[in-house]
Structure formats: C-alpha cells, structure tokens
C-alpha cells in the first residue's frame, strides 16, 4: 500500500510541478519594474523569457515577442533552453510514469519492467525539476547583477535639473513560479525513486523463499511468491493477485516522474 | 458618441464641501480609468485626481490630498469628485476626462465651476 | 514630481507659416520597456475643453490634422503646426503622461500677428 501511495503521491506531485514549470515558461513576468524610486508609475514593465510588456496606467498593455535570435543575451538563452529541456523531460517521464503506475494494468506487463520505467521517470523528473530550479536561478543571478549595477549608475544624465533615471528589474512572479515547481518536480522524482525500490523484486528474497519452499512447499509455494510480486502470468496466479492475497503496496508501488505536461 | 457631462458646481464658502459627478455615455465605461482636471480662471491645466476602472488604484495630487476622494459607480456610468475643506484656491472649473492608450486624456467634458468664496 | 516647463509663453504668428512649440521635463520620459515617450500635447480653445492632439510625444490621434507633428525624445520635445490656420490660434499644452502626479506645462499661447 505505501508503494502505490509512494508512486501515486510522486506522480501527483510532479504532475503539479511540470505544470508549473510549462506555466512559469509561458509567463511574462519574470522580471518586473522595480517601483522603489517611483512608486506612482504610470507605467509599468514587465519581462518574460519570450516578450517584454508595457501596462500603462491606462489599462492598455502592449507586448513585443523578441522577434532576434542573436541579438538575445546568452544568458537568456540558456535559461530558454533549461527551461525548455525541463519540460520536454518532464513531459516524457510523465508519459513513462503513466504506464509505471501500480494501479494501471498494461497487459502482462512485469514488476520489474514497472519499476524501470517507475526508476527512469523518477530520474527524469529529478532532472527535469533541476533544469527548472537551475535555469530560474540563472535568470535571478542576472537580475541581481543588472539590478546592481543600475543602481550604481542610477542617474545616467544629471544636466542641471534633468534626470534620466534608468530602469530598474527586480524578481517576477514566474521566479518564485519557476522555484516552487521545479522543487515539486524534484521532489516529485526522488519519490517516485523510492516507489521503484518497494516495486523491484529482490534477488535475496527470492532466495530465501524458493530455500523455506522446501520445508513448506504449501505455504511458500513459488507461484504464491510470484503471483505476489506480479511475476506469475497464469491466471490462478492473477486470481490469487486480484483476490488481494497481498496488498498492493506490498505488491509494487513507485512513484513516477512524468507529473506535468 | 462618447459623451461626459459633469454636474455638481456651484458656489461653497470656505471649508465648505460639494460632491461633483460625471455623466457618461458612448462608451464601456467600466473598461476606463478616469480622471479630474481642474483649471483655474485665465490659468493654466491642473490634474487633480485618477481613478482605474475597478476602482482599486486612486492618485491625487498633492493639494488636494485627504480632502478630495474620487470614486465610481460603474452600475450607473457616473464618476465623482467628493470636495471637502475646501479653499480659496480650490476655485476653478472642473472637467473629468477618461484615460486612454499612450495614458492621454482622449474625451473630455465640458466642465463645471466651482467657486469657492466667503 | 516631474516639472514640466514650456516656451515661449506666446507666440506671434501669422496664418500659413511654420511654427514651432518647446515642452522640456525635469525627469526622462522615455519608457524604456517600449522606447516610447510619454508626452502627450493638447489644444485648448477658449470657452472649450481641452482636445488631445498627440500622445507617445508623435502619435496623433484621430481627427487631428496632419500639419501637427511631435518630435523629440527624453526631456525636449517639439510641437510643429507646418501650415498655421486661423482655427490654430490658441492655447497649447504639453503633459507628462509617465508618472504620477499627471502634470502640465503652463502653455504656449499663439496669436496673431
């Protein structure tokens, strides 16, 4: 039972993250104007990974795509493509943990071909989880810089009474979007890791049945053992699985990777 | 046609208190921020007051500041310009005009006076 | 709060001729996030509410003749009538439309000569 939790929880979770993480990509506002020097602004402006807006006072916004590909700040780059190999990770792991879960019949599909996939979903979450964290905190280690280094040059023109006073960003909401599910995702993945343990067969076990089998053929009887492990395809085997001779945690719980697309 | 009547002015003494209101029509106005300027006899422009369209965000300027409170009723198409301790300087002709793109003030209305003597 | 100052006060002019209008702000008013200048220039004649000539410092609105033209970027800007007719002869103000409070220079009056 605590593995099919373990897996079904691990699921979830990273289902919410890669959601947030799609989410935290697709929003405009990962950097936001700082209001501290003039907090009655008339107008206000934002920053995403793909366009930059302009809400005036008015009510009206206007947004521009970044229509250049070369033009763009390498940093900003590489915070697209984490961003982007987040979620392509994610979304495929989501679709292997789909088929991994416990509670999802697929065939005659094995245990143990449950909890590889069940494995390679949690480590794709994980993966996924930190391309998020690392290409959100890329993007924040940029706009502290810029942050500083404006602030430093705060008035770029002082003619008598006339000031340019220059822009300044600080963290958008899709930051701390970005944060939260990718640390969902990880979390997501390393749980999902945990499922495949409690899923894969062990040798020892084993061993150590097929020995006492000799002694007590009836009550450890292999097909028994298999039937509760998921291995035994016969259907006096299923009987015995589907009859809930074993739990199903015990059986095989795993939480997948793939929670979000 | 987008129209904006104001109404509400007249003569007060000093301290005194009067509530302004604007009309309006041709237009959504739930979907505009609007504002009041104000101009004072043979002077020049000054604005006074904003309000955003959801009535969450208010600007006053400086003068006018814990003595006037704009407010709108977008169920009837009428914002107001709520005047109290008024003074002597507070004597101009109102005009409320509703906020555009480029943050322009595209329509105006006509005006009313407000004459503040003892 | 941003100062607007305008110059001159008034100007001389006679129908037909070019005339130029100066709008100076004590603070920028250059949007970064968009490259546009949050100026806006009005026409005020007497008796009348003012009417919206130009917004973002060049935009003209609608209806507005195209003998008006708004140049200038940051803190100096320019109002340009090509072609002064006789229905110009009036009061022009310029506003900041960048930050709160909104305010307006004193105006230039053109009169004829």
């Known amino acids: 039972m605590a593995v099919t939790a373990c897996q079904g929880l691990g699921f979830v979770v990273s289902l919410i993250g890669i959601a947030g993480i799609i989410a935290a990509t697709c929003m405009d506002q990962w950097s936001t104007q700082d209001l501290y020097n003039n907090p009655v602004t008339a107008v206000f402006n934002y920053q995403g990974l793909w366009r930059s807006c302009v809400r005036e006072s008015s009510g009206f916004t206007e947004c521009r795509g970044y229509f250049t590909l070369l033009g763009l700040p390498a940093m900003l780059q590489a915070v697209r493509a984490l961003m982007i190999v987040g979620i392509v990770l994610g979304a495929i792991g989501l679709l292997v943990s789909i088929f991994a879960l416990k509670c999802i019949r697929i065939g005659s599909m094995e245990d143990s071909a449950k909890a590889n996939m069940t494995l390679t979903s949690g480590i794709m979450f994980i993966v996924s989880g930190l391309c998020a964290i690392a290409g959100v905190s890329v993007f924040a280690n940029m706009l502290v810089t810029n942050f500083w280094m404006s602030t430093a040059n705060m008035y770029t023109g002082m003619g008598g009474m006339v000031q340019t006073v220059q822009t300044r960003y600080t963290f958008g909401a899709a930051l701390f979007v970005g944060w939260v599910a990718g640390g969902l995702t990880l979390i997501g993945g390393v749980m999902m890791c945990i499922a495949c343990r409690g899923l894969a067969p062990e040798e020892t076990n084993y061993k150590a049945v097929s020995y006492h089998a000799s002694g007590h053929s009836v009550a450890y009887k292999p097909g028994g053992f298999k039937a509760s492990t998921g291995f035994g395809s016969n259907t006096k085997n299923k009987k015995i699985y589907d009859g809930g001779a074993r739990t199903e945690d015990e059986v095989q719980s795993y939480p997948s990777k793939h929670d979000y697309v | 046609e987008v129209q904006l009547v104001e109404s509400g002015g007249g003569s007060v003494k000093p301290g005194g208190s009067r509530k302004l209101s604007c009309a309006a029509s041709?237009?959504?106005?739930?979907?505009?921020?609007m504002h009041w300027v104000r101009q004072a006899p043979e002077k020049g422009l000054e604005w006074v007051a904003y309000i955003s369209s959801g009535s969450n965000t208010f600007y006053y300027t400086d003068t006018v500041k814990g003595r006037f409170t704009i407010s709108r009723d977008n169920a009837k198409n009428t914002l107001f310009l709520q005047m109290t301790g008024l003074r002597s300087e507070d004597t101009a002709m109102y005009y409320c005009?509703?906020?555009?793109?480029?943050?322009?003030?595209?329509?105006w209305g006509q005006g009313t006076s407000v004459t503040v003597s003892s | 709060d941003i100062v607007m100052t305008q110059s001159p006060s008034s100007l001389t002019v006679t129908a037909g001729e070019k005339v130029t209008m100066s709008c100076k702000s004590s603070?920028?008013?250059?949007?970064?996030?968009?490259?546009?200048?949050?100026l806006t220039w009005y026409q005020q004649k007497p008796g009348q509410p003012p009417k919206l000539l130009l917004y973002?410092?060049?935009t003209r609105e609608s209806g507005v003749p195209d003998r008006f033209t708004g140049s200038g970027s940051g803190t100096d800007f320019t109002l340009t009538i090509s072609s002064v007719q006789a229905e110009d002869l009036t009061v022009y103000y310029c506003q900041n439309a960048y930050s709160y409070p909104l305010t307006f220079g004193a105006g230039t009056k053109l009169e004829l000569k």
């Open positions: 603070q920028s008013l250059l949007n970064s996030g968009n490259q546009k200048n949050y």
């Open positions: 041709g237009f959504t106005f739930s979907d505009y921020g």
């Open positions: 973002w410092a060049s």
């Open positions: 005009a509703r906020f555009t793109r480029g943050n322009a003030l595209d329509y």
